[in-house]
C-alpha cells in the first residue's frame, strides 16, 4: 500500500437546503483506470461511512441507489454532493481515495471538510 | 504567511450603513470561512456571522439578521460585512477572522463609530 | 443556542503563579469544538487552543486546555508578565458559534 497526497477544502456551510458540495483532489503517482472514493464522517470521537464509490476513469460516479452522496469526477478530482443533511449531521467529513486498478494500490485520506449545517428556522403560524 | 488585512475607521450617523472590508492573503481562499465579530466599547466578544469562501453561504446571529450582509470576492480573496440602519449601540470595534473551523487568524480591527 | 459562562470573572495573581480559568456550556460542545482566545488591550484577539487542548502555533507550552463535554479549563502554569489580559472561550461545533463573557487576569 503506498501513500498519496489528498486535499479538500478545511471548512463549507451546507446550503439551507441541507446540501454540501465539495472538491477532493489526489495527487495521483501512475495513470489509475479504477478508483474508489469513501466519505467518512467523524464526529465526537466516532468515525461512520458516509457513502462510497467505485468509478472507471472517465466514467460517472455511481453511488446505491439509496445513497445521500451524488459525485461527478474531472481528472484527478471528485466533485462531491451531499444532500438531505441537518444541523445534527455537522462535522468533519473526510475524503479517502483509493486507486485499485492498476497495481500498485494507492490509499490517500484527506484532512476533512467541516461541514456546518444549519436547520432552517421554522416558519411562523399563519392563519390562512 | 496568513494576514487579514481589514478597511481603516468609519464614522457613520444613526440610519445609515456601513460596509467593512477584509483582504486575505497566504492561503487559499475559498478553503476556509470567514467569521466577523465585534466588541463594543469595555465590551467583550459578540459573534455576528460567517461565510463559507467556498461556496457563498451564510449564516448570521439571530439579533442581527436583516441587517447584515456578508460576502466574498474571490477573484481579489477579499470578505465584506455591511451593517445596515446603524444605531449607537453599533458603535464597536469589527474583526474579520479566518474559519479553520476555529478563528485562527484575526484581522487588525476597524472602528466604527455611530454618533449623531 | 450554546451558553457558554466562564469564572471567575476576574483572577488577581502574581507572576509565577498559576492560573486556572473555567469555561462551562449550557449544553455539550460536540467534538471537544472550545477554543481559548487571548486579548490584550487595544489588539485582536489570539487563538491559543483549540480542540479543548491542541496548542495554536507559537503558543508557549505554559498553556494548556483540557475538558471535554460542558466543562473545560485553561492553565496557565507560570505567569509571565506578558500573559496579563483577557481570556475568552468560544465553541465552534455548532452554529451559532459562541464566545464566553472573558474572564481577566490581572496583576495582584
Known amino acids: 500500500c503506498k501513500a498519496m497526497h489528498v486535499a479538500q477544502p478545511a471548512v463549507v456551510l451546507a446550503s439551507s437546503r441541507g446540501i454540501a458540495s465539495f472538491v477532493c483532489e489526489y495527487a495521483s503517482p501512475g495513470k489509475a483506470t479504477e478508483v474508489r472514493v469513501t466519505v467518512l464522517r467523524q464526529a465526537d470521537s466516532q468515525v461512520t461511512e458516509v457513502c462510497a464509490a467505485t468509478y472507471m476513469m472517465g466514467n460517472e460516479l455511481t453511488f446505491l441507489d439509496d445513497s445521500i452522496c451524488t459525485g461527478t469526477s474531472s481528472g484527478n478530482q471528485v466533485n462531491l454532493t451531499i444532500q438531505g443533511l441537518r444541523a445534527m449531521d455537522t462535522g468533519l467529513y473526510i475524503c479517502k481515495v483509493e486507486l485499485m486498478y492498476p497495481p500498485p494500490y494507492y490509499l490517500g485520506i484527506g484532512n476533512g471538510t467541516q461541514i456546518y449545517v444549519i436547520d432552517p428556522e421554522p416558519c411562523p403560524d399563519s392563519d390562512f | 504567511q496568513v494576514q487579514l488585512v481589514q478597511s481603516g475607521a468609519e464614522v457613520k450617523k444613526p440610519g445609515a450603513s456601513v460596509k467593512v472590508s477584509c483582504k486575505a492573503s497566504?492561503?487559499?481562499?475559498?478553503?476556509?470561512?470567514i467569521t466577523w465579530v465585534r466588541q463594543a466599547p469595555g465590551q467583550g466578544l459578540e459573534w455576528m456571522g460567517w461565510?463559507?469562501?467556498?461556496?457563498?453561504?451564510?449564516n448570521y446571529a439571530q439579533k442581527l439578521q436583516g441587517r447584515v450582509t456578508m460576502t466574498t470576492d474571490t477573484s481579489t480573496s477579499t470578505a465584506y460585512m455591511e451593517l445596515r440602519s446603524l444605531r449607537s449601540d453599533d458603535t464597536a470595534v469589527y474583526y474579520c477572522?479566518?474559519?479553520?473551523?476555529?478563528?485562527?487568524?484575526w484581522g487588525q480591527g476597524t472602528l466604527v463609530t455611530v454618533s449623531s | 443556542e450554546i451558553v457558554l459562562t466562564q469564572s471567575p470573572g476576574t483572577l488577581s495573581l502574581s507572576p509565577g503563579e498559576r492560573a486556572t480559568l473555567s469555561c462551562r456550556a449550557s449544553?455539550?460542545?460536540?467534538?471537544?469544538?472550545l477554543a481559548w482566545y487571548q486579548q490584550k488591550p487595544g489588539q485582536a484577539p489570539r487563538l491559543l487552543i483549540y480542540?479543548?487542548?491542541s496548542r495554536a502555533t507559537g503558543i508557549p507550552d505554559r498553556f494548556s486546555g483540557s475538558g471535554s463535554g460542558t466543562d473545560f479549563t485553561l492553565t496557565i502554569s507560570r505567569l509571565e508578565p506578558e500573559d496579563f489580559a483577557v481570556y475568552y472561550c468560544?465553541?465552534?461545533?455548532?452554529?451559532?458559534?459562541?464566545f464566553g463573557p472573558g474572564t481577566k487576569v490581572d496583576i495582584k
Open positions: 461565510i463559507s469562501a467556498y461556496n457563498g453561504n451564510t
Open positions: 468560544q465553541q465552534y461545533g455548532r452554529s451559532p458559534f459562541t
Open positions: 480542540g479543548a487542548s
Open positions: 449544553q455539550s460542545v460536540s467534538s471537544s469544538y
Open positions: 497566504g492561503y487559499t481562499f475559498t478553503n476556509y470561512g
Open positions: 477572522a479566518r474559519v479553520a473551523p476555529y478563528f485562527d487568524y
